[in-house]
């Protein structure tokens, strides 16, 4: 991905009970599985047609999985996050970040990129002003005619 | 999205082998998990076995005659076919999902997998 590219972030506690087949999610990441350049982070890769997560819909690709049950994700191989997922009980509560992409291309989840996010207001002041200053000149030009 | 490519199917003598390649596109294939399916005329598409990041299984109907492998430098998965019967005789598919079941360790549902090959033939006399 060429030039910067700039995320709104947002947290959740999303609560899941287990289906007849699981949660119906696959993850990547992990300390010996890095998706995201510089995160060991647990990403969902993955949503399950019909699966738990997917009827729910609150799940995204592209979304970071800080805990299950309350338990950090940080600094797990890859293999040991997806043992923690399948021994978590019929009940799953997870903590979610999801990254919302709002410059640098349409508005849509990220499964990669650069992790970092910005506040709302470095978004939403620019847009304010440059309405004031179209409304501004639409005035002037209103009052010359 | 990630495009699969198999090669190395053909005609071959009962008892005999083969190697199907199966070589994928994406810069993370490291993490994807792969399965091989097979679909004999007017039959359902067969689980053969998958490959994931932390081990590999066959399907009982070909369990200890064929094995999976991958090399994550090439992006391509092999299955190695040995013993092979009549039986055998299908069109044989590779399929990718990116990441890891956190519901099953070998996903054999056609279902758990997005991407698919165009299948190569295998014909055993």
């Known amino acids: 991905m060429n030039g910067r590219v700039d995320y709104l972030v947002t947290e959740e506690e999303i609560n899941l009970t287990r289906g007849p087949s699981g949660l119906g999610f696959n993850i990547v990441g992990g300390t010996d599985q890095q998706y995201v350049s510089n995160d060991s982070g647990i990403y969902v890769s993955r949503i399950k047609e019909n699966g738990a997560a997917a009827l729910d819909g609150r799940l995204q690709e592209g979304d970071k999985i800080l805990s299950v049950n309350g338990q950090d994700l940080k600094n797990l191989l890859h293999q040991d996050a997806v043992d923690l997922f399948r021994n978590a009980g019929y009940a799953v509560s997870l903590r979610v970040q999801h990254r919302l992409q709002v410059q640098n291309g349409p508005i849509g989840h990220r499964g990669e990129g650069d992790p970092s996010g910005i506040p709302i207001f470095m978004v939403l002041v620019p847009v304010f002003a440059l309405t004031m200053v179209a409304a501004w000149a639409f005035m002037r030009y209103r009052q010359q005619l | 999205d990630v495009q699969l490519v198999e090669s190395g199917g053909g005609l071959v003598q009962a008892g005999g082998s083969l190697r199907l390649s199966c070589a994928a596109s994406?810069?993370?294939?490291?993490?994807?998990?792969l399965g091989w399916f097979r679909q004999a005329p007017g039959k359902e598409r067969e689980f053969v076995g998958t490959i994931t990041w932390s081990g590999s299984s066959t399907a009982d109907s070909v369990k200890g005659r064929f094995t999976i492998s991958r090399d994550n430098a090439k992006n391509t998965v092999y299955l190695q076919m040995n013993s092979l019967k009549p039986e055998d005789t299908a069109v044989y598919y590779c399929?990718?999902?990116?990441?890891?079941?956190?519901?099953?360790?070998?996903?054999?549902?056609?279902?758990?997998?997005?991407?698919w090959g165009q299948g190569t033939q295998v014909t055993v006399s």
């Open positions: 994406g810069r993370t294939f490291s993490t994807y998990t």
């Open positions: 399929a990718a999902a990116i990441g890891s079941s956190v519901d099953s360790d070998y996903p054999s549902d056609p279902l758990e997998y997005d991407y």
